[in-house]
Amino acid sequence: WELTILHTNDVHSRLEQTSEDSSKCVNASRCMGGVARLFTKVQQIRRAEPNVLLLDAGDQYQGTIWFTVYKGAEVAHFMNALRYDAMALGNHEFDNGVEGLIEPLLKEAKFPILSANIKAKGPLASQISGLYLPYKVLPVGDEVVGIVGYTSKETPFLSNPGTNLVFEDEITALQPEVDKLKTLNVNKIIALGHSGFETDKLIAQKVRGVDVVVGGHSNTFLYTGNPPSKEVPAGKYPFIVTSDDGRKVPVVQAYAFGKYLGYLKIEFDERGNVISSHGNPILLNSSIPEDPSIKADINKWRIKLDNYSTQELGKTIVYLDGSSQSCRFRECNMGNLICDAMINNNLRHADEMFWNHVSMCILNGGGIRSPIDERNNGTITWENLAAVLPFGGTFDLVQLKGSTLKKAFEHSVHRYGQSTGEFLQVGGIHVVYDLSRKPGDRVVKLDVLCTKCRVPSYDPLKMDEIYKVILPNFLANGGDGFQMIKDELLRHDSGDQDINVVSTYISKMKVIYPAVEGRIKFS
């Protein structure tokens, strides 16, 4: 018996087609993705093949103006229209709190939304009961397929799930649900979830009874053969993990932003064992036409967005590199721009001894969600910025000891190379890392811009000195694992909305050309 699994993950509000780098579509003939194009391909496969599931592995929420304006209603509407069979909750589904998940999505979705490792407690338990499920058994052709969901246990550090949701260890929570499905004679089980590729592989290895793992969160691109676009494969598709009980378990993910549709064919024997698995992500490029009815619906929903944010704020004459491939690995000019805007927004001439009260900015690279292409006449709009900074956060002022900052920069590279969001972009700081050293001892130079000076210059960080730093509220609250900031900050004052800070700076500067200038170096 053959099953076709179609899957998406980390779509992040890319309802409309995008440029190849998943930023706003500029040249329509070269644009990719979007729900109208996705629907065309899904329908084509559904017509051609008998046993098809369309699954999403989380993080539909957050990423463009669509989410800023519609707050998840757009996700429910268009996923319903595409007839998704199931979705796993991602960390970003909690960005507007639990209410922002329940009302627009959980109550409106016509498909099951899954997570086995999220447990509700207190008054929320009865309110959310039945709105998301640990597993779902679906009829597929003449067979049944069990789908168990999971969500990153790091979600409380990454989003706003509140205090009444407990995020358990994925493997610990999944095993009893899979065991239950087995006792109910479900012998074909997919783990669908949002914890990242490393956890996906662990689930495949450790959870007895899981036949296939469909993941998300790490934006992992897997491909067998010559990849069709710019993404470099992290491994073959599917990635095969040998489980502890000796089974070959296919693990898949489909990059992000709706650029690809994951396509996996699994052959099962009569006992539900995987005999074979093969496939590849399908690049949703312009060779696939956009479905006219979905496109018309997109255009109808689009009207509200146009009024919101299409005015030009200023111009860029350089490419603003906000790609995760840059900002999570090295100094990127989008990070520099944002940090410069953050400092500029906090210019307060204190007295004759200080040129300013604050000179330093840190910004988690994972918070930069899109680049901006200068080839659209250089125009920058609020809409463009909303794709870069979609989280609706604030840029806050904190006071920290030098020792805390040093810990933060060690944390920045403690697991360097995994495309994780904690890699710091900076302003008013020069940092040098030596990645050959062990985690926790990789910062070899950390110089900070003086404030008590008439001519600003860089001096070595002093461990016992107290510094003011501008940073996202996300970091002030210990997000992306920066618990040391939350635990050790001496003062915290909330600031202005992130997009507004950057838009004001761009409007003020009129023309911008941020460079990569050696703020972050590797020895």
Epitope: L133, K136, V137, P139, D142, E143, V144, N185
Partner: antibody
Framework: QVQLVESGGGVAQPGRSLSLSCAAS????????MHWVRQAPGKGLEWVAL????????YYADSVKGRFSISRDNSKNTLYLQMNSLRAEDTAVYYC????????????WGQGTLVTVSS | EIVLTQSPATLSLSPGERATLSCRAS??????LAWYQQKPGQAPRLLIY???NRATGIPARFSGSGSGTDFTLTISSLEPEDFAVYYC?????????FGPGTKVDIK
């Protein structure tokens, strides 16, 4: 032990409605698909409808599609069959049945309730 | 819709004899075929599922075989309590059909 007890049968006029219930016990009701199967007097078995364990899917025989509606209340361990626009040919004993393994077997049957459609 | 045909309509045998009941499908039903026994005034009872698996508590004298379109229920040595009506049943795409039944009576 598994028990299925049907109720609600009786006499109804053609074109009228009737509602059957089935009280389940002895197993985790919310884990199992449930069916209604009927048997006209002196005739064979005829499958009527299936409802998924969580009520997310329903399937019907062509002979009742659009007239009958299967539903369940997992909090009350109860299965229902709402029968509208009844016809003489709907006269039968109606059995409540538990699905044993995703439709490959119907493993526990109630004793049935008689529905008579007559003017 | 898949139609099931059972033969013979009636099988007259004596206790201790072997009974062979046939069920033919109008198209392939894979392995999803079950057999039920019904005695007068009682609800049906599951005997065999997935063509050849005996249900819990069913004596070993009952066995099922076949695949695709042709299936057989065999009672190796009829006991007095085995005289009843036997139905085959299939499911295809979640639509279920029963055969018309075979009556096994005492000769």
């Amino acid at each position: 032990q598994v028990q299925l007890v049907e109720s609600g049968g009786g006499v109804a006029q053609p074109g009228r409605s009737l509602s059957l219930s089935c009280a389940a016990s002895g197993f985790t009701f919310s884990d199992y698909g449930m069916h209604w199967v009927r048997q006209a007097p002196g005739k064979g078995l005829e499958w009527v409808a299936l409802i998924w364990y969580d009520a997310s899917f329903e399937y019907y025989a062509d002979s009742v599609k659009g007239r009958f509606s299967i539903s369940r209340d997992n909090s009350k361990n109860t299965l229902y069959l709402q029968m509208n626009s009844l016809r003489a040919e709907d006269t039968a004993v109606y059995y409540c049945v538990r699905e044993g393994q995703w439709g490959s077997r119907l493993d526990y049957w109630g004793q049935g309730t008689l529905v008579t459609v007559s003017s | 819709e898949i139609v099931l045909t059972q033969s013979p309509a009636t099988l007259s045998l004596s206790p201790g004899e072997r009974a062979t009941l046939s069920c033919r499908a109008s198209q392939s039903v894979s392995r999803y075929l079950a057999w039920y026994q019904q005695k007068p005034g009682q609800a049906p009872r599951l005997l065999i599922y997935d063509a050849s698996n005996r249900a819990t508590g069913i004596p070993a004298r009952f066995s099922g075989s076949g695949s695709g379109t042709d299936f057989t229920l065999t009672i190796s040595s009829l006991e007095p309590e085995d005289f009843a009506v036997y139905y085959c049943q299939q499911r295809s795409n979640w639509i279920f059909t029963f055969g018309p039944g075979t009556k096994v009576d005492i000769k």
